[in-house]
């Protein structure tokens, strides 16, 4: 660290005297000190020499000494104050720019301790602190005002009392700024945009800034808009806005628009693109299949997918039939937008009947024309089973009937006793039918099936049972046969709650 | 809340003095808190400031009127008097008395106005 | 002296419309602007002091802003009541001054 002679942390001398001060480090040294007239400066390797043989009270300050070369950065210092009783203050600065909240340091150095008893800060011509001004002295630095706000940029005088009478430093102009958080928020609106060649369109940019001092432009692929900008005050924020009107888009204007602005903060920006079409559109899409199959009872969402523009003049959801003249209640149908240009077309069928099974279609009309996106609807049917004892060309034989959707498969089981359905360990006999006979196979129905099973002599102790399942659930009859005629047993009754 | 009151004459011939008094009720005129103004409005235009005075008698006067300017301060009374010399019809106006905030540098609280006019 | 330039001059206005007002001073006179408003035979009024602070019983529709030289009065929803003549007036250096004035009449 280096040493400073004379070796004491003040010192007070008159107008017109000789200062020398002197430091010494192991190293080359430096002095640094407030910025006065008169002083010379003698530097001898490890050691410099700063003296004046005329001090004023401008040479009032605080004189540091540093060693460049010390790793450690070690500096030593010494204030100097020149009493002059003419001139109890040395301003550094007449100018001090800070932040809000930020201390500002309104630099007179008093030049004579003797006086820090009566010093005083006060505003020009005398007038008192604004109210709320939280401050503190130094007489090495000076006059500190704690956590600055805006109305308090003003021009202040540091005072103190000389012989009963108060003598004003020069003034000094603090200029406190608002804090800019970062660069100014931004919209562009809309976020996208379709026109039609020919029609009028506007792009609105806009950015704020709790400070005035931020710039905003428009870019379209790249190329800066000259527009006229308005601005505003609003919510304690300055806006900046630009608006881009245009009578009668072209292919031309198509493309990328780029709200940017910037402040010292650095720079924010937004895009949209702008689509510009030859005439009207209008499109129909689903990410589900057309086709589509649920089980009776469950619930189903019909989603439909519209890009268009202009606008929909009109839209509904209507059923096609086969069952009924039944049209989805409104309630059911939902539509939700997307963006400006997509929507989405919900109708929902809850616990779905029989009679609802067939063909939905969704219309949509602009000034492109009418769309419509329709879905098959089939419902999925567990089998229902019916045995009955027939002859067929003199043959003793019993007919199955099976229905359901999809197409039920059918089994045939003998088993011993008799019970309203076989068990494994009671089954005798099993034949699988790979292909019964379709009865009926008509779009959004049921599928009827037959299957016969030839049987010379009915075992009296027995019982034949028909099985029919799919991926839906399965059913079931037993045929137990009694020595007046034929006994059947059809399966506990399938319940069905739409 | 400070409120004041202006009297004087409405008339006043030319080369005479103008001589107005504003009367304060509601505060103190010797609070440190305020300056005791005084302002001018010219038919139909803006306003103009004249000068204003301390509680103790320090005083700030615009420099066009300076020459012929004296405001005064009786704090017994509760007044402060504005004197304008060797006026004429440019000095015809609406004069105001206004309480400066000090703290503030602002005009808060102002008298009703009276017109004075120059005229033979 | 300092001197305040205000613009317009003159504003017509519909009720509920926003009315923008600018001052400039001549010189840096930081945040010791102040507004005032004088509706028609009646002394002013103070609104706005060092630039955006409400005086007491001021309504929130009106605000100010600005800083350094270039400061804005803004009226939010203009009312009936409003309509009056509207002055900024700098305190930084005697002597003091006020602008030319801004009068707000309503269509």
């Known amino acids: 660290i280096p040493v400073i002679e004379p070796s004491v942390p003040e010192l007070v001398v008159k107008p017109g005297a000789t200062v020398t001060l002197r430091c010494v480090g192991n190293g080359s040294v430096e002095w640094d000190g407030p910025p006065s007239p008169h002083w010379t400066l003698y530097s001898d390797g490890s050691s410099s020499i700063l003296s004046t043989n005329n001090a004023t009270f401008q040479n009032t300050g605080t004189y540091r000494c540093t060693e460049p070369g010390d790793p450690l950065g070690g500096s030593a210092a010494i204030h100097l104050y020149v009493k002059d009783p003419a001139r109890p203050w040395n301003v550094l600065a007449q100018e001090v720019v800070v932040f809000e909240d930020q201390d500002a340091l309104l630099p007179c150095l008093l030049t004579d301790p003797v006086l820090e008893a009566g010093v005083s800060l006060v505003r020009v011509r005398g007038r008192p602190l604004m109210r709320h001004t939280n401050y503190s002295f130094s007489p090495w630095h000076g006059f500190t005002i704690h956590r600055a706000k805006f109305i308090q940029s003003q021009d202040y005088q540091c005072s103190a009392l000389m012989g009963g009478r108060k003598v004003m430093s020069i003034s000094i102009r603090l200029k406190v700024q608002k804090v800019i958080p970062g660069p100014p928020a931004l919209t562009l609106v809309p976020a996208e945009l379709v026109r039609i060649r020919g029609e009028a369109a506007q792009i609105v940019c806009s950015a704020s800034s709790v400070d005035v001092n931020f710039d905003v432009f428009l870019q379209h692929n790249n190329t800066k808009l000259a527009i006229p900008q308005q601005s505003d005050f609003h919510n304690n924020r300055y806006q900046k806005v630009l608006t881009l009107n245009l009578d009668q888009v072209d292919f031309q204007h198509a493309g990328n628009y780029s709200c940017v602005a910037s402040n010292v903060q650095g720079k924010h920006s937004t895009s949209m693109f702008f689509r510009v079409v030859e005439s009207a559109y209008l499109n129909l899409s689903s990410e589900q299949n057309l086709i589509q199959e649920v089980t009776v009872g469950e619930g189903l969402n019909l989603k439909v997918m519209v890009e268009a523009y202009p606008g929909l003049q009109g839209f509904n959801w209507t059923y096609l039939g086969p069952f009924s003249d039944h049209q989805p209640e409104p309630k059911l149908a939902n539509a939700t937008t997307k963006d400006t240009y997509r929507h989405t077309f919900t109708l929902s069928l809850p616990r779905l009947k029989p009679s609802e099974a067939g063909r939905y279609s969704f219309l949509a009309r602009n000034p492109g024309g009418w769309r419509a996106l329709t879905f098959e609807l089939t419902l999925r049917y567990p089998p229902e089973v019916s045995v009955i004892w027939t002859f067929i060309n003199g043959s003793g034989t019993l007919l199955c009937a099976a229905s359901g959707y999809p197409q039920p498969n059918v089994t045939w089981l003998q088993c011993s006793g008799h019970t309203d359905r076989c068990d494994e360990a009671q089954v005798l006999q099993v034949w699988d039918d790979p292909y019964p006979e379709v009865l009926s196979q008509e779009p959004f129905h049921k599928v009827t099936v037959q299957s016969l099973l030839t049987v010379e002599t009915l075992e009296h102790n027995q019982t034949y049972e028909c099985r029919a399942h799919n991926s839906v659930g399965s059913g079931s009859w037993a045929f137990i046969p009694i020595s007046a005629g034929a006994h059947t047993h059809p399966p506990d009754e399938f319940l069905f709650t739409p | 809340q400070v409120q004041l009151q202006e009297s004087g004459p409405g008339l006043v011939k030319p080369s005479q003095t103008l001589s107005l008094t504003c009367t304060v009720s509601g505060g103190s005129i010797s609070s440190g808190g305020y300056y005791w103004s005084w302002i001018r409005q010219h038919p139909g235009k803006g306003l103009e400031w004249i000068g204003y005075i301390s509680y103790s008698g320090d005083t700030y006067y615009n420099p066009s009127l300076k020459s012929r300017l004296t405001i005064s301060v009786d704090t017994s009374k509760h007044q402060f008097s504005l004197r304008l010399s060797s006026v004429t019809s440019a000095d015809t106006a609406v004069y105001y008395c206004a309480s400066l905030d000090l703290y503030g540098d602002y005009f808060d609280y102002w008298g009703q106005g009276t017109l004075v006019t120059v005229s033979s | 002296e300092i001197v305040l330039t205000q613009s317009p001059d003159f504003q017509s206005v519909t009720p509920k419309e926003k009315v923008t007002i600018t001052c400039r001073a001549s010189q840096y006179i930081g945040s010791s602007l102040h507004w005032y408003q004088q509706t028609p035979d009646q002394s002013p009024k103070l609104l706005i002091n060092?630039?955006?602070q409400s005086f007491s019983g001021v309504p929130s529709r009106f605000s100010g802003s600005g800083s350094g030289t270039d400061f804005t009065l803004t009226i939010n929803s203009l009312e009936a009541e409003d309509a009056a003549t509207y002055y900024c007036h700098q305190s930084s250096s005697l002597p003091f001054t006020f602008g030319p004035g801004t009068k707000v009449d309503i269509k």
């Open positions: 060092y630039v955006s």
